[in-house]
């Protein structure tokens, strides 16, 4: 039960995280005009990864796409790449994790296969989250560098007179969305990896010995903590964990009317 919960929660958290990464990537407010200690303007500038926008106090907003590819700063291209890689990995991870979910049955998929898929999706989520966090952090670092450079430029010039007001940019909402989303995807990935450990049966030196009685089979396990009953004949030897009480998730389950195919 705990493994199913961990896997399910990991999936949901990752889903929210990836939705957030997509939202952050599409958002226009990666950097916004710094209003602190600046003359109050009737125009507000903000920029995204794909376009820059100007909102006038009149309410009129104009956005222009970056129609050049070669003319863009390498850092911006790198951030775009990191975010896209994060989205792609996250999307694949989500697809894999859907089939890996314990509550969903696809034919006669082995628990070991589900465990492998859970681990794969978990790693994908972790890498996806790291890509998003890295992308946002690179952009934030770029902003901080430019901010202090423009601040220095504001106080230089002819006799210290400010000839033109330089627009300084600070962190936009998309950065915070990206950081949080990346973090959630990372946490979701870790949860999936933890769930994988619970799903994957570990090899031990002991094998279960099945004694077939008429009507039903009972597997007697060395250590004698729990006996599992199945429907029909089950001749498969089950791998055993080293002693201790186990949750239902750790015991191979059998199809029931409540299972989804």
């Amino acid at each position: 039960m705990a493994v199913t919960a961990c896997q399910g929660l990991g999936f949901v958290v990752s889903l929210i995280g990836i939705a957030g990464i997509i939202a952050a990537t599409c958002m226009d407010q990666w950097s916004t005009q710094d209003l602190y200690n600046n003359p109050v303007t009737a125009v507000f500038n903000y920029q995204g990864l794909w376009r820059s926008c100007v909102r006038e106090s009149s309410g009129f907003t104009e956005c222009r796409g970056y129609f050049t590819l070669l003319g863009l700063p390498a850092m911006l291209q790198a951030v775009r790449a990191l975010m896209i890689v994060g989205i792609v990995l996250g999307a694949i991870g989500l697809l894999v994790s859907i089939f890996a979910l314990k509550c969903i049955r696809i034919g006669s998929m082995e628990d070991s296969a589900k465990a492998n898929m859970t681990l794969t999706s978990g790693i994908m989520f972790i890498v996806s989250g790291l890509c998003a966090i890295a992308g946002v952090s690179v952009f934030a670092n770029m902003l901080v560098t430019n901010f202090w450079m423009s601040t220095a430029n504001m106080y230089t010039g002819m006799g210290g007179m400010v000839q033109t007001v330089q627009t300084r940019y600070t962190f936009g909402a998309a950065l915070f969305v990206g950081w949080v989303a990346g973090g959630l995807t990372l946490i979701g990935g870790v949860m999936m990896c933890i769930a994988c450990r619970g799903l994957a049966p570990e090899e031990t030196n002991y094998k279960a010995v099945s004694y077939h009685a008429s009507g039903h089979s009972v597997a007697y396990k060395p250590g004698g903590f729990k006996a599992s009953t199945g429907f029909g004949s089950n001749t498969k030897n089950k791998k055993i964990y080293d002693g201790g009480a186990r949750t239902e998730d750790e015991v191979q389950s059998y199809p029931s009317k409540h299972d989804y195919v």
């Epitope: 005009q33 003359p39 109050v40 303007t41 009737a42 125009v43 500038n45 920029q47 820059s52 926008c53 100007v54 006038e56 106090s57 009149s58 309410g59 009129f60 104009e62 222009r64 400010v162 000839q163 033109t164 007001v165 330089q166 627009t167």
Partner: antibody, heavy 118, light 113 residues
Framework: QVQLQQSGREVVRPGTSVKVSCKPS????????IDWVKQRPGQGLEWIGG????????VYNEKFKAKATLTADKSSMTANMQLSSLTSDDSAVYFC???????????WGQGTLVTVSA | DIVMSQSPSSLTVTAGEKVTMSCKSS????????????LTWYQQKPGQPPKLLIY???TRESGVPDRFTGSGSGKDFTLTISSVQAEDLALYYC?????????FGAGTKLELK
């Protein structure tokens, strides 16, 4: 077409207050900012401030902050400007105008002449 | 506050003549975000409210005759009337639409010779 209809001329005593109203028509009242401009006889134009009728947010020229109060009534679709503690310096024509792209004023009221006289 | 300086204060012209008037701002009105200059030109005739002619320094308002042209960038702006008509005789104001408070120039009066 877009029109801004202002209230009639006012003759008031020094130290009192006056309320000038502006009723736009021909567009959605809450979609555009309304600005107020002062013009003394034979003088230039001075921007007093602006109001967003949708949100009630205001922005003032620091010079007029203590003098003018801008309000907007969505139910009657009217923008108002209250001028307080009037002196002879406040005798002027007051215009309301609609702010559009470029933060420019494309439509103006006909003007309200306020005369402060003892 | 941004100071808008207009020159000359008055101009005496003959019909059909080309006229230029200047407006200088104490700070650049160019917005780096969209490369637009937030300067507006208005025409005001006696007893009337001002009329919008040009916004964004060079964009003509709809219905304004094409003899009116706005130009300039940063701090220096010009309004040109290619061929003055009798109905163009009025006061012309430039306005800073970038910094608060929004400020107007003192105006240029266009008179007939």
């Amino acid at each position: 077409q877009v029109q801004l209809q202002q209230s009639g001329r006012e003759v008031v005593r020094p130290g009192t207050s006056v309320k000038v109203s502006c009723k736009p028509s021909g567009y959605a009242f809450t979609n555009y900012l309304i600005d107020w401009v002062k013009q003394r006889p034979g003088q230039g134009l001075e921007w007093i401030g602006g109001i967003n009728p949708g949100s009630g947010d205001t922005v003032y020229n620091e010079k007029f902050k203590a003098k003018a109060t801008l309000t907007a009534d969505k139910s009657s679709m009217t923008a108002n400007m209250q001028l307080s503690s009037l002196t002879s310096d406040d005798s002027a024509v007051y215009f309301c105008a609609r702010r559009v792209r470029g933060n420019s004023f494309d439509s103006w009221g006909q003007g309200t002449l306020v005369t402060v006289s003892a | 506050d941004i100071v808008m300086s207009q020159s000359p204060s008055s101009l005496t012209v003959t019909a059909g003549e080309k006229v230029t008037m200047s407006c200088k701002s104490s700070q650049s009105l160019l917005n780096s975000g969209n490369q637009k200059n937030y300067l507006t030109w208005y025409q005001q005739k006696p007893g009337q409210p001002p009329k919008l002619l040009i916004y964004w320094a060079s964009t003509r308002e709809s219905g304004v005759p094409d003899r009116f042209t706005g130009s300039g960038s940063g701090k220096d702006f010009t309004l040109t009337i290619s061929s003055v008509q009798a109905e163009d005789l009025a006061l012309y104001y430039c306005q800073n639409n970038y910094f608060y408070p929004l400020t107007f120039g003192a105006g240029t009066k266009l008179e007939l010779k």
